[in-house]
């Protein structure tokens, strides 16, 4: 559309230039041309002349009516056919928009990624509104009652420097557009409970040349958090089923995890951690691929029979992809509950 044009008259929209999608809309054009008594007044939508539902109200004014207008944006303009003029004369133009009031933001989550210096809050915005919609994030200290507000489009990063006054906050999100306003549910946040440890990285893996070969996976994190609880998932690249093992980790040194795996197979490993007893997980680390060595002698292979040395692992769970056509989407088929959380929670998946 054209943001500003010199009008020789007026154009107005009922119920307004921004309205709810699906509403009936009337657009009026009133000419104020000098030296012209128009034979006809014409309406154009996005540059195309309209043919139907146009009413000439009087000498200077016409109206076009749309039943159930459902285009998110349109540029309307109207013209006059003046006697003696070869071309139509522009009267006025308007940008019009249709959309929806916002849904109440849902699934509000706030986390502090270790070393980031920010509290990051995200939420689900709901169905598309098609019009400019802003989100006001309210952060209210439960200790001082002071409230801060931040404008956002889809998420917000709030400097922890501005959260020095207290540790406990109430957070909620207000969605606002021209057609309405909705509030999310309130989230109680304790800054000490929402820290996600610095990223965990698998640095290398090796398979020993023992009678019963074992694979040692080395992994690390720069976290300063003392008590960290981690999961490592692994599978062959040809398999759809992940096995998941748990560990209590102390990152003052590089972690070593031992696995007894199928020989001559390509395995994918990923790890994620959380502060022990807390809710928020890291995303899964980048996939680390390791090829186990070939079997040297025949033996009965029992993948789960040997102990997992150096670790306090407890349970192995299996996570299976929905279908071979959607390897990115994983879901728990038989979830073993690990210390109060399912292995499927909050994960980033690869096939």
């Amino acid at each position: 559309g054209i943001t500003s044009i010199n009008c020789s008259g007026d154009m107005w929209v009922e119920p307004g230039e921004i309205f709810q999608m699906g509403m009936n809309v009337s657009i009026y054009c009133q000419e104020a041309l000098k030296h012209c008594r128009p034979r006809n007044l014409y309406f154009y939508k996005n540059g195309f002349k309209e043919e139907f539902d146009i009413t000439r109200i009087n000498r200077t004014t016409a109206r076009i009516w749309y039943k159930g207008f459902s285009e998110p944006h349109a540029y309307m303009h109207c013209t006059a056919e003046c006697p003696g003029h070869f071309q139509e004369t522009l009267i006025c133009g308007k940008d019009i928009s249709s959309g929806h009031p916002p849904d109440a933001p849902s699934n509000l989550t706030c986390v502090i990624y270790e070393y980031s210096g920010n509290m990051t809050c995200t939420w689900n915005t709901g169905k598309p509104t098609y019009i400019d919609t802003k989100y006001i994030v309210h952060v209210k200290s439960l200790e001082t009652e002071e409230e801060q507000q931040y404008l956002a489009s889809s998420y917000v990063k709030i400097s922890t420097d501005s959260l020095q006054g207290s540790r406990k906050y109430l957070v909620w999100v207000q969605a606002v557009n021209s057609l309405g306003m909705e509030n999310s549910q309130q989230l109680h946040v304790h800054l000490d409970d929402i820290v996600i440890p610095s990223a965990s990285i698998i640095s290398r893996a090796e398979t020993t040349n023992d009678t019963v070969p074992k694979t040692i996976v080395y992994w690390k994190s720069k976290t300063m958090i003392e008590k960290v609880f981690c999961e490592m998932r692994y599978k062959t690249t040809t398999n759809q089923t992940w096995s998941v093992k748990e560990f209590d980790a102390n990152f003052t040194y590089v972690q070593q995890s031992e696995f007894y795996l199928e020989p001559d197979s390509k395995y994918v490993f990923q790890v994620r951690c959380q502060e022990t007893g807390k809710r928020n997980w890291q995303p899964w680390s980048s996939p680390f691929v390791h090829q186990t060595s070939q079997e040297t002698g025949k033996r009965n292979w029992q993948p789960w029979s040997s102990p997992f040395v150096h670790q306090t692992s407890q349970t192995v769970s299996q996570v299976t992809a929905k279908s071979s056509h959607e390897p990115q989407k994983m879901e728990m088929l038989s979830a073993t509950i690990f210390r109060g959380h399912p292995a499927s929670g909050n994960h980033q998946d690869i096939g």
Partner: nanobody, 116 residues
Framework: QVQLQESGGGLVQPGGSLRLSCATS????????MRWVRQAPGKGVEWVSG???????IYADSVKGRFTISKDNAKNTLYLQMNSLKTEDTAMYYC??????????GSQGTQVTVSS
């Protein structure tokens, strides 16, 4: 306690410009979101524009593209630059804490009159 003092209003012709100021004290201005609202004679309070502590802004459709809200944390002052003024912008203008809302509390306001 919180104090807000608006200034900069006046009489201006349609198409003209004004810059409103809101001097503040009694709270941590740099961490506080602020807004402008207005009240035309015989009408309700209308929210105009808001700005958060990081400087992100939001505007009512009726003023979008014509008004600009800003804040100077060093001076603890909120501003509203009003261009291409229309007769329907005639109102008493108030500043308030918070990005959004059609209320204000206790400040005296500044009168803006747009007339030819």
């Amino acid at each position: 306690q919180v104090q807000l003092q608006e200034s900069g209003g006046g009489l201006v012709q349609p198409g003209g410009s004004l810059r409103l100021s809101c001097a503040t004290s009694g709270f941590t201005f740099r961490l506080t979101a602020m807004r402008w609202v207005r009240q035309a004679p015989g009408k309700g309070v209308e929210w105009v524009s808001g700005i958060d502590s990081a400087g992100s802004t939001i505007y009512a459709d009726s003023v979008k593209g014509r008004f600009t809200i800003s804040k100077d944390n060093a001076k603890n002052t909120l501003y509203l630059q009003m261009n291409s003024l229309k007769t329907e912008d005639t109102a008493m203008y108030y500043c308030a804490q918070g990005v959004y809302g059609d209320t204000y509390s206790g400040s005296q306001g500044t009168q803006v009159t747009v007339s030819s």
